[in-house]
Interface confidence: low
């Protein structure tokens, strides 16, 4: 059993290492602010792949079973409060990056086999949004994202599992905001 776990872990570490590099690349890029419409876009084809769509939803469901705290919502109307439609993709980019860095990577050994497939997929989406910026002040967006981060941090591991349980909503929200 230990050997099996080790082989799964080593396979996963390779996958996650690639994902981490992708993420580091996008974090380093930064770049000057560009008009919203030019880079805050994802191709519709990213959300039209039955296999990875299903794996993302299965991962969310698996995580749902591991947490009984059904009263707290992370991705909901409050997240988008005061954020215009044209800024929502940028907002979701922030949520996606936080979810990858602070939730999925630390929990990478759980919820197999879905995690090892979904994390690289989400990391690719994150990479494609690396040049997505908005012109002007984004404080209102950062404030909303910070509330989500604070909620996850306050709940500890339970918050991380809750975030994984909401990957279905993250997927749908990214689709709605970014295509």
């Amino acid at each position: 059993m230990a050997a099996l776990q080790k082989s799964v872990s080593s396979f996963l570490m390779g996958t996650l290492a690639t994902s981490c590099l992708l993420l580091l690349a996008l974090l380093v890029q930064g770049g000057a602010a560009a008009p919203i419409s030019s880079h805050c876009r994802l191709d519709k084809s990213n959300f039209q792949q039955p296999y990875i769509t299903n794996r993302t939803f299965m991962l969310a469901k698996e995580a749902s079973l591991a947490d009984n705290n059904t009263d707290v919502r992370l991705i909901g109307e409050k997240l988008f409060h005061g954020v215009s439609m044209s800024e929502r993709c940028y907002l979701m980019k922030q949520v996606l990056n936080f979810t990858l860095e602070e939730v999925l990577f630390p929990q990478s050994d759980r919820f197999q086999p879905y995690m090892q497939e979904v994390v690289p997929f989400l990391a690719r989406l994150s990479n494609r949004l690396s040049t997505c910026h908005i012109e002007g002040d984004d404080l209102h967006i950062q404030r909303n994202v910070q509330k989500l981060k604070d909620t996850v941090k306050k709940l500890g591991e339970s918050g991380e599992i809750k975030a994984i349980g909401e990957l279905d909503l993250l997927f749908m929200s990214l689709r709605n905001a970014c295509i």
Epitope: F47, Q48, K61, T70, R73, L74, D168
Partner: antibody, heavy 121, light 111 residues
Amino acid sequence: QVQLVQSGAEVKKPGASVKVSCKASGYTFTHYYMHWVRQAPGQGLEWVGWINPYTGGAFYAQKFQGRVTMTRDTSINTAYMELSRLGSDDTAVYYCAREPEKFDSPNAEIWGRGTMVTISS
Amino acid sequence: QAVLTQPSSVSGAPGQRVTISCTGSSSNIGAGYGVHWYQQLPGTAPKLLIYGNSNRPSGVPDRFSGSKSGTSASLAITGLQAEDEADYYCQSYDSSLSGYVFGTGTQLTVL
């Protein structure tokens, strides 16, 4: 056994809102997505949206976005669908339907009996 | 409204075989999403008949079978019986709409 029991028939005036409930029993409510589907008299089935009872997160068909709200109360294993700004073309039977646990093949496995909503001035 | 197209009606004599087609597009059936079939008897809620293209839930007779090819699917009913008279709907997931879609519905008449 698994059952979905829906609230009774409603008659509403144009412009009003209606809230239909769906009480689940015989299974763990938070483990399964719940869908809402409607059927106008003599017409086909139309998907309204789904709610994830675990998170409370909902996703709606584009046609209904801005007009529909799906919620749930996990303490009483009940899902709700509220439709606002009702018009005569919203007259229909509204069904709740539970999806199987595996999302590989999303479909409506268990159905409620439906709630007839009539819009009449 | 409906994204999946079905014939409005089909009919057959008892004991015969009938098929109901369901035509979609590259964003639903053709994209690889499963096709599911429902039977709706008059005045009742729909009942799941076939899921994931060709699987039967327990309790559904093996007279009912489903298949899928390309952007289309079909439901076959063999040994037609009077109690099979109902409306039949296909359903899938559509990635361009990011939602579930139903067929237009087919009324089956047993002659």
